[in-house]
Amino acid sequence: MVPPPENVRMNSVNFKNILQWESPAFAKGNLTFTAQYLSYRIFQDKCMNTTLTECDFSSLSKYGDHTLRVRAEFADEHSDWVNITFCPVDDTIIGPPGMQVEVLADSLHMRFLAPKIENEYETWTMKNVYNSWTYNVQYWKNGTDEKFQITPQYDFEVLRNLEPWTTYCVQVRGFLPDRNKAGEWSEPVCEQTTHDETVPS
């Protein structure tokens, strides 16, 4: 009896959908695996007789529920199928946006770049897919614990009237208000402000 794959899960970030599993202990030899997806009542092979423990399902439609399954194989024997269901538009993890930060005196000027949909040739981004897409920004004085959050209305934001000659850290994430779903935070970018531009009277 061939044991089934273990810990079967979907690892999906920005619609790059990788089904992953672990090979069970099997004394007779090395196992191979076949992974399939359901397409209108028929299961279609995606990865056949692979020695890998993952399979790329990124071509599946972003919309709708998909049934995926994987089994282990050895010679003419095979395990039972392990099934999972997956809805990319609901389940994919929203990766961190890009961010450009420029210091102008006592202001930080930020521009945000929505994460690209993985593995497509064109420049479609997660913002295209989700109509309610917005950004959350949090910033803080470097070395302090107090963080401030803002929700920019556009793909850019300016933090004004900051303390001069002070290092501020900023990070951004995507947020979907209609789903109450937050993406991953970008790595913090820390920049030092310069002088206060106000002219003494």
């Epitope: 071509s59 439609s61 972003k62 919309y63 064109e122 479609w124």
Partner: nanobody
Framework: QVQLQESGGGSVQAGGSLRLSCAAS????????MGWFRQAPGKEREGVAF???????RYADSVEGRFTISKDNAKNTLYLQMNSLKPEDTAMYYC????????????????????WGQGTQVTVSS
């Protein structure tokens, strides 16, 4: 939300021609990968012709050289020109779309398209 509406089906003699249309709503039509599928009575739905957002096309072996898929981004419409029709082309024809997609995956399976029309009937008699 994308809405698709097929038209142009009908009855034709073997050897004749038909042109199917699929009107799509949405202002990002140029970003769609699209396809035509068909389902004959008692058979599974099968892919017929596909066009990616970059305009590249693919066909099922059974229709290669007889059918031509195209799309007019200005009119938000997908077409299937069917020539030299055969009785075995008789089926309900459906158009399908996947927004924000490109030619990266050469989509041709039903599970790779998220939006579907209601279908238009094509009947070819001998």
């Amino acid at each position: 939300q994308v809405q698709l509406q097929e038209s142009g089906g009908g009855s034709v003699q073997a050897g004749g021609s038909l042109r199917l249309s699929c009107a799509a709503s949405g202002d990002t039509y140029s970003s769609y990968c699209m396809g035509w599928f068909r389902q004959a009575p008692g058979k599974e739905r099968e892919g017929v012709a596909f066009i990616d957002s970059d305009g590249s096309t693919r066909y099922a072996d059974s229709v290669e050289g007889r059918f031509t898929i195209s799309k007019d981004n200005a009119k938000n419409t997908l077409y299937l020109q069917m020539n030299s029709l055969k009785p075995e082309d008789t089926a309900m024809y459906y158009c399908a779309a996947e927004p924000y997609c490109s030619g990266g995956y050469h989509r041709k399976e039903m599970a790779e398209f998220g939006y579907w029309g209601q279908g238009t009937q094509v009947t070819v008699s001998s």
